[in-house]
Interface confidence: medium
């Protein structure tokens, strides 16, 4: 049995920030789980992780330099990404693993969400393209 994930097909980050909600066909209440958001068709970049534990506070972190926060619902995790760059426009996939209690569960690959980052500066100078992140 696999967990099904629903995501918006497309989101636009007008102010370099976006809320991406991952909705699961599974109730995460009193479960130990690891929800993550991945960038790219090959999901090569792990953007943000939300680690949930029935006995401890929610842990949210990024090992890849993204500014992220996370919020937990009964059957959802919402990732809040800030300070996105235009060149981080890409497809983003939600993933989930439930480690405890058994059985171990993970998700069917979702369709992903295209996040279109529209920067504050609409016409950046080609001579000064600005900073870039992975």
């Amino acid at each position: 049995n696999k967990i099904l994930v629903k995501q918006s097909p497309m989101l636009v980050a007008y102010d370099n920030a976006v809320n991406l909600s991952c909705k699961y066909s599974y109730n995460l209440f009193s479960r130990e789980f690891r929800a993550s958001l991945h960038k790219g068709l090959d999901s090569a970049v792990e953007v943000c992780v939300v680690y949930g534990n029935y006995s401890q506070q929610l842990q949210v972190y990024s090992k890849t330099g993204f500014n992220c926060d996370g919020k937990l619902g009964n059957e959802s995790v919402t990732f809040y990404l800030q300070n996105l760059y235009v060149n981080q426009t890409d497809i983003y996939f939600c993933k989930i693993e439930v480690m405890y209690p058994p059985p171990y569960l993970d998700n069917e690959k979702s369709n992903g969400t295209i996040i279109h980052v529209k920067g504050k500066h609409l016409c950046p100078s080609p001579l000064f393209p600005g900073p870039s992140k992975p």
């Epitope: 690891r34 993550s36 991945h38 534990n53 842990q59 693993e97 405890y100 171990y104």
Partner: antibody
Framework: EVQLVESGGGLVQPGGSLRLSCAAS????????MSWFRQVPGKGLEWVSV???????HYADSVKGRFTISRHNSENTLFLQMNSLRTEDTAVYYC??????????????????WGQGTTVTVSS | EIVLTQSPATLSLSPGERATLSCRAS??????LAWYQQKPGQAPRLLIY???NRATGIPARFSGSGSGTDFTLTISSLEPEDFAVYYC?????????FGQGTKVEIK
């Protein structure tokens, strides 16, 4: 180089205690799921305990209440405190890291790094 | 707990031959099954994860298949270094469990 090195095994009497250590290099213990396994020589493998990156711990029924898994983040070391040891705890003990798949990015798929093992003998 | 039964207990083959090892679970483990190789005096080595994915650095002669309750590890052409004990392990249910092992020995 990614490596795990166990120590702390030895001969102990029934009812005694031992503390096993597992020093990691090349990766960070606290960012990974880490488990202890054991193997009676010539027999199969048995999972003993796990500590998740989030800090929670789980145990096999056979050691619950007697063994405690923990980690020392700054020393990048995993521990297994074994109390009230029984003769049936005699085995080679291995620490191992749960792997991260590059293809799916899922966190937990199998034990991809193992220590060399340390022998625990419980006998009077 | 889920019981994994491996067969045969011992497989006697010559280098260059094909080895087929079986692992049967007492209930469905989906594809959450791994295979390990262990040589005397050494720790186990991960070969296959999630039933059919080769771990990093594992030669292409090792392949895994199956889902649900029946799984197979195939070594297409045995090399001298492949003679060892092979274990299957499930992570679908608690606790994680191993099969009793199949010894692949030189005929």
């Amino acid at each position: 180089e990614v490596q795990l090195v166990e120590s702390g095994g030895g001969l102990v009497q029934p009812g005694g205690s031992l503390r096993l250590s597992c020093a990691a290099s090349g990766f960070t213990v606290r960012s990974n799921f880490m488990s202890w396994f054991r193997q009676v020589p010539g027999k199969g493998l048995e999972w003993v305990s796990v500590i998740y990156s989030g800090g929670s711990t789980h145990y096999a029924d056979s050691v619950k209440g007697r063994f405690t898994i923990s980690r020392h983040n700054s020393e990048n070391t995993l521990f297994l405190q074994m109390n009230s040891l029984r003769t049936e705890d005699t085995a080679v003990y291995y620490c191992a890291r749960h792997g991260i798949s590059g293809t799916t990015s899922y966190y937990y798929y199998g034990m991809d790094v193992w220590g060399q093992g340390t022998t625990v003998t419980v006998s009077s | 707990e889920i019981v994994l039964t491996q067969s045969p207990a011992t497989l006697s083959l010559s280098p260059g031959e094909r080895a087929t090892l079986s692992c049967r679970a007492s209930q469905s483990v989906s594809t959450y099954l791994a295979w390990y190789q262990q040589k005397p005096g050494q720790a186990p080595r991960l070969l296959i994860y999630d039933a059919s994915n080769r771990a990093t650095g594992i030669p292409a002669r090792f392949s895994g298949s199956g889902s649900g309750t029946d799984f197979t590890l195939t070594i297409s052409s045995l090399e001298p270094e492949d003679f060892a004990v092979y274990y299957c392990q499930q992570r679908s249910n608690w606790p994680p469990t191993f099969g009793q092992g199949t010894k692949v020995e030189i005929k």
